[in-house]
Every structure is written in structure tokens, then in C-alpha cells.
């Protein structure tokens, strides 16, 4: 049978050939009659057999990491007969490991983020090195990790490569650290190979800093004429944190008058002091307010770092402006009865200079020539007023400072003209009245109504009467309907166009004013040949129209 021991060949041998062992048949008595042969992958190129002795040699440098074993076949032949002495047999040559590979960090680059101020022992990252050597061959691939750079802030677990924090770090002092980790094989024994890797450890921000005002005192000025919403000035607080942890909000602590407010400029994180109410130099020339700043987002566990919020004092100086005059009232409503003589005082308006110098005023009036104003602000009539012409006057009074005529203010003055009963009622229209020749007694000839140009506090009430003076006109009669209308009735049967073509009826209309006014009105009644229809609608076309005027007494 075959005789051999396990074959091993060390990798990376530099010799031209290396004796591995001997293959032989136990039938080989050394009579020089056997020939040994090697077959299979690597035979003749990597491995050579001395065909006389069965000695096997490696003639190439081998790399276990490339190939760790070779399976070959052995033959032994009797030279004399050419026949196999033993059955062909498979055998294995194992390439034994030497420590020829250094540990390598395959997952580079390493980068980790850990919150600042993390406590000792906090896990940062695990780095892992790989060693291509045989893990089952001694300590060739057994690794130990150590820290070459990064003390005293970091430590590494020797067997796991876990990096932990060993000292608290403040991002505001240094925000990133380069840690160098070394991995050594042979568990660090002499002859060990090593590899290193760099780990970039970035500290993420925690809100461990409160915002602090850059200045403890700010001085701003604002014109008293500044409108609401005006930016008065900017205040600035600094927070060493970043991002959301540096977001801040400003507030005003001492401002009982609620005149100021602070809004934030999100781009610059500045506080903008704005005007919430108008200021008046003459009322208050400066304001002292205190502003406070705090972070928008504070975790409970970091609250102790945020007690005693930073404050700053802001002095706002109000600048005096030459202000225009100010009327006592925003507008005026004055009343005057109609019919008063010119020069009658309607009322008085008053404007004053809000500034300390108290300039005298000069007044101007526009909107109607019926009024004038003097330097005291007294408005008088320049004409007699007739309510029936205009019941209201819309005037504009302009006040100007005599010291500075550019400073002008205006106020509206509304003058209401009161009614007095100075107008008698009269026919509401011109009546074209016709009566048919064949009219019967009691037949309605005309319904009349009146108007009164006066204003009535209550409703107007008109009284209609046939004038007693109109004695020659008994052909018609008047009936007051008590509803501000009256009806004219035929008082006879039949009229003669040729003999009496026209009748003039004098009608008195009185109002209910105090005192009452009465007007005399003449109603012209024309006789018309209506035919059988007794319809006066065609009468106007017959050229019988007599245009008569009104007469009012």
C-alpha cells in the first residue's frame, strides 16, 4: 500500500524548491525498479516528484490566501513491466499559513456622529479589521485594537474595536476629532503586523448654551411721526450652539405702555424692535424697556443651562417733530336756522399746535362762499341761508401755523341749515283742467294736490278752501279730502262753450306750520265739447289750451 504522512508546505517560501515529504509504496525495496508519478492541478508546475524516490518538492512560492490546498494524484509504476504497483491515489497538500497579511480596515472611511457632552462609556462606532491569514492557524489572524490618536477623549475595546467616549467633549470648543485606531495581529505579540484606520468623529450639537446679548445696553431714537410697525433698531444675542439649538426668541419685559414689540429676523437671528403704538414727544420724550432672549427649543434635561435668561436695557429716545396743527375734533357739525342775516355766527372750530412752541393758528375755509372764518376759528354767514336752496354745507377748514405755514391740517365742517316755515304750499303741478259741456252736477272735474318746499318736522298737512272772494264762481265746488288732496266737482248740469269757455277758480291752500302760511292758487277750467263720450281726453288736442300762471300770496 501507499505510505505517506500528511503533507504541508509553508506559504511564501523563498527557496527554489522546498521538500514537502515522500510518497512511496511499501513494495518499494529500493531495487530501482519503481517510478513515481504526480498528476493533477499543480503537478509539474507547482509540485515536482522525484520519480525515483517519491520525494515531493514545491518549486513555486505559494500563497495560502490565494489557494490553501492542492489535491493531487499519485501513481507508482514498475519500470520493468510498465504496470501500476499501487492503485492511483488522491492526496492533499495543505499550504500552511504564515503571518504575511496585515490587518485591513475594509469599511473605510469611518465617520461617526455623537452628541457633545455625551457621558463616558457612550458608544461612538465599531471599527472592524480583517486579516486574510488563517484564523485557525495560531494567532496569525487574532487581532487587538489600540488607540494611536484620540486620547484622552476616546478609548477602544481591544478585542471588539468598539470606540467609546472616555471624556466629555464640548462641541463649542472643538467640533470634530480624528481618531487613529491600530489593529495588530498575533494578539500584539512580537512579529505582529498592523494596520491603521482614521475615524472622523463629529460632535453633534446639544442645546447646552443659552443665548446672551452682545450688548447690555442699546440706545435707539425714533421720530414721533413714525407710523406703527416702524423698525426702531436691532438687538442681537449670540448663542454658541448651532441650528435649531441656536434659534431664539426675544421678548419685552418692562413696557407697561405696550408701545414696543420685538420680532425676529429669521435669517440673522436679530431682534427687531418695532413700534406697536404711536409715540408723542410732547407726552413722553424717552422710554426705557428691558428685553429678554431665550432659546425656542430647550430639552428638559438641559433646562439648568438656561436659567436666568440674558436681558438687555433699551433706551428709546423720541425725537421731536414739527407736527401739523391738531383740531380739537376730528370733524364738526354746526347748525343754523335759515333766513338769518349775513354775519350770523354759525360756530367755532379750534386747532392747536401740538409742539411745545404753541404757534398761533390762521384759518382758511373752502367749500362755500356762503361762509367765512376769522382767526379765532369763528365761522359766520356771508349771505342769508335758504334751507330750500341747500340744507347742508360741506366745508373744509384749514388751519396753518403762523410760524411755519407748511404745517397744515384740515377738518371737515358740516353745516346743517334748520328749516323755518317760510314757504306756503302750492299746487304740486300745473293743472290742465277741462269740463264737458254736457257734464252733470257732482261730476269730478279735477283732483288737486299741494307741495310745500319747507321741511316738516312732522308730515305736512294741507288745508284746501274755495276763496270766499271768488263769488262769481258757483259753477264748481271744492271738497278737502283731508289727505293733502282736494276734489273739484261740477256744481251744475251742462256748460256752454261758446258763452263761457273758461272758468277761473281761486283756491286757498294753508299749511300746518306755526305760524301757518296760506297761498292763493287759480285753477283754470276750460269747457270742452266732449261729444257723447263725456271724455275730456281729446280736449287738449282741440287747441283750447290756455296756459295760466300761478299766483301765490
Amino acid at each position: 500500500g501507499w505510505v505517506w504522512n500528511q503533507f504541508f508546505v509553508p506559504e511564501e517560501m523563498n527557496t527554489t524548491s522546498h521538500h514537502i515529504g515522500q510518497l512511496r509504496s511499501d513494495l518499494d525495496n529500493g531495487n530501482n525498479s519503481f517510478q513515481y508519478k504526480l498528476l493533477g492541478a499543480g503537478a509539474g508546475s507547482t509540485f515536482i516528484i522525484d520519480e525515483r524516490t517519491g520525494d515531493i518538492y514545491a518549486i513555486q512560492k505559494l500563497d495560502r490566501e490565494e489557494r490553501s490546498l492542492y489535491i493531487l494524484r499519485a501513481q507508482v509504476i514498475d519500470i520493468a513491466t510498465g504496470r501500476a504497483v499501487e492503485p492511483e491515489s488522491e492526496f492533499v497538500i495543505k499550504v500552511s499559513d504564515i503571518n504575511d497579511n496585515e490587518p485591513k480596515f475594509l469599511d473605510e472611511p469611518y465617520e461617526a456622529i455623537v452628541p457633545e457632552m455625551s457621558p463616558e462609556g457612550t458608544l461612538v462606532i465599531q471599527v472592524t479589521a480583517s486579516d486574510a491569514d488563517d484564523p485557525s492557524s495560531g494567532n496569525n489572524a487574532r487581532l487587538l485594537y489600540s488607540l494611536l490618536q484620540g486620547q484622552p477623549y476616546f478609548s477602544v475595546e481591544p478585542t471588539t474595536g468598539v470606540i467609546r467616549i472616555s471624556s466629555k467633549m464640548d462641541r463649542e470648543l472643538q467640533d470634530e476629532y480624528w481618531v487613529i485606531i491600530q489593529a495588530k495581529d498575533m494578539i500584539g505579540q512580537p512579529g505582529a503586523l498592523s494596520g491603521t484606520t482614521s475615524v472622523l468623529i463629529k460632535l453633534s450639537d446639544v442645546n447646552d448654551n443659552k443665548p446672551i446679548f452682545k450688548e447690555s445696553f442699546y440706545r435707539f431714537t425714533i421720530s414721533e411721526s413714525a407710523p406703527i410697525g416702524t423698525s426702531i433698531g436691532k438687538i442681537m444675542a449670540y448663542d454658541d450652539d448651532i441650528g435649531e439649538n441656536a434659534e431664539m426668541e426675544y421678548s419685552i419685559e418692562d413696557d407697561d405702555s405696550k408701545i414696543f414689540d420685538i420680532i425676529i429676523d429669521n435669517d440673522t437671528q436679530e431682534g427687531i424692535v418695532i413700534l406697536k403704538k404711536k409715540v408723542d414727544f410732547e407726552q413722553q420724550s424717552y422710554y426705557g424697556i428691558r428685553a429678554k432672549v431665550k432659546n425656542c427649543h430647550v430639552d428638559e434635561e438641559l433646562a439648568p443651562a438656561h436659567v436666568n435668561a440674558s436681558t438687555t436695557y433699551i433706551k428709546v429716545q423720541v425725537e421731536d417733530e414739527d407736527e401739523p396743527p391738531v383740531f380739537l375734533l376730528p370733524y364738526y357739525i354746526l347748525e343754523i336756522p335759515e333766513g338769518k342775516p349775513y354775519g350770523t355766527i354759525v360756530g367755532t372750530v379750534s386747532a392747536t399746535d401740538p409742539d411745545r412752541r404753541q404757534s398761533p393758528m390762521r384759518y382758511y375755509l373752502t367749500g362755500s362762499k356762503m361762509f367765512d372764518i376769522n382767526d379765532n376759528g369763528t365761522i359766520i354767514t356771508t349771505n342769508m341761508l335758504d334751507r330750500e336752496v341747500s340744507a347742508w354745507y360741506n366745508l373744509t377748514v384749514t388751519a396753518t401755523e403762523t410760524y411755519n405755514v407748511q404745517q397744515i391740517s384740515s377738518a371737515h365742517v358740516y353745516v346743517q341749515v334748520f328749516n323755518i316755515n317760510d314757504n306756503a304750499p302750492e299746487f304740486s303741478q300745473f293743472y290742465e283742467t277741462y269740463v264737458c259741456e254736457n257734464a252733470e252736477s257732482g261730476e269730478i272735474v279735477q283732483i288737486i294736490s299741494a307741495i310745500d318746499r319747507d321741511e316738516s318736522i312732522e308730515d305736512h298737512h294741507f288745508y284746501f278752501n274755495h276763496s270766499l272772494e271768488d263769488t262769481n264762481n258757483s259753477s264748481f265746488m271744492l271738497t278737502d279730502n283731508q289727505d293733502n288732496t282736494a276734489v273739484i266737482l261740477s256744481n251744475r248740469t251742462g256748460f256752454n262753450l261758446k258763452e263761457e269757455p273758461v272758468f277761473y277758480m281761486i283756491i286757498l291752500i294753508a299749511d300746518n306750520g306755526i305760524p301757518s302760511l296760506t297761498s292763493t292758487n287759480t285753477l283754470t277750467i276750460q269747457v270742452c265739447d266732449c261729444g257723447d263720450s263725456r271724455n275730456t281726453e281729446t280736449c287738449a288736442n282741440k287747441g283750447l289750451l290756455f296756459i295760466m300762471g300761478f299766483r301765490t300770496e
Partner: antibody, heavy 122, light 108 residues
Framework: QVQLQESGPGLVKPSETLSLTCTVS????????WSWIRQPPGKGLEWIGY???????NYNPSLKSRVTISVDTSKNQFSLKLSSVTAADTALYYC????????????????WGQGTMVTVSS | DIVLTQSPGTLSLSPGERATLSCRAS???????LAWYQQKPGQAPRLLIY???SRATGIPDRFSGSGSGTDFTLTISRLEPEDFAVYYC?????????FGQGTRLEMK
Amino acid sequence: QVQLQESGPGLVKPSETLSLTCTVSGGSINSYYWSWIRQPPGKGLEWIGYIYYIGSTNYNPSLKSRVTISVDTSKNQFSLKLSSVTAADTALYYCARESRYRSGWYDAFDIWGQGTMVTVSS
Amino acid sequence: DIVLTQSPGTLSLSPGERATLSCRASQSVAGSYLAWYQQKPGQAPRLLIYGASSRATGIPDRFSGSGSGTDFTLTISRLEPEDFAVYYCQQYGKSPITFGQGTRLEMK
């Protein structure tokens, strides 16, 4: 064609080590067996031993304890070391190549060097 | 070890004659692995015959070998002047390789 050339000191003191080198030119040392043979003055030939190019050796039992044959394929050379020499080791030393007339076992020597004379004397 | 005995020790012949050299082994030579060499003064041996009967490259056909087992013969059919030299037989069928003591072929 392949030629062999022996080299080494011609005089060696008794008890010292005789060292010779055979340089192969005109061909490769690979795939052949290479022998050392000596011939004392006026006497016949004695085979000392061979080396296979991979380093496998076989020595004459009569000299085995004192002989070392080695090969350096990079230089195309093989060497002989004979330790503890005496006057009986004075001889003409030849290097020779076994032919490949047949596949397998030992073969005849088809190429010889011209020989180098080594005298052992104090 | 296999001991090879060559005879005669010296053989005196004239050119043109036939020479027969003998080599006897102390035990059978496996595979007829026997060779013949020619050595002239001041020269290295030269291979003539291998495998008992095969002529080496460039050897004239007047040289022939025969035999098996323990008895082997080298024959030179017609001696040429350059053939006068010392002839050695060698067995390489079993380690160690051994040579005969040699036969001197001299011109008569």
C-alpha cells in the same frame, strides 16, 4: 549544445571540505538528474551521487556521510561538498548529466564536464 | 552493491580487427540498464551504448552492445585507430551506480 564546466580549488587540506561547482551552459538545469563522478589517478570511475533539479538527492552509501550535493537553478549550477577529506579523496572530479533516453528510472551519462583535479595534501 | 568485472583487463589488437569486450555483473542488472563508455587519455568518458544495446547519438555503427542479466558484451566490428582507449561498463539498474574497472584496448 549543453556543456558542463567544473570549478573549485585544486588543492584541499586533509580534514577540510572539498567544494566544487558545476556550471551548466547551453541549456537548462531543469528536468535532469546531475551527478558527480570521480576518478583517482590511474584508477576507474566512482559514482559519488546525484541531485534532481528540484533538490532531491541520492548518494553513494560509501560516501553518504560526507557528501552534500545542492542545486541553484537560478544560476544553472549544482555543487559538491565533501567533508573531512583525506589523501584517498585525491582524484579527477567530473560532473555529468544523466540522459533522458528513457522515461523513468536511472539513465546513462550522456554529457560530461572535462573534469577538475583535486589534490588533498597538507 | 552490484560489482561489475570487465575482461580482459587489456586487449591488444590491430586496426581493422574485431574487438570483443566482456562485462559480468555480480547480480542481474534490472532492465538491462547497462552502459559502455570510451575514455581517452586526458579526456572525459564518452557514452557509447546505453540499455545494453542502444547506440548513443553520433556513435558509429561499428560499435554494438549485447547481453542481459549478468553477461554483457561490447563489440567493435572493425577497429579504427581512434578506437584505441580504455572502455568502462556501468550499471544503472540499481543504486548505487557502479562502474567496471575498465578494459584497455591497445594497438598491437
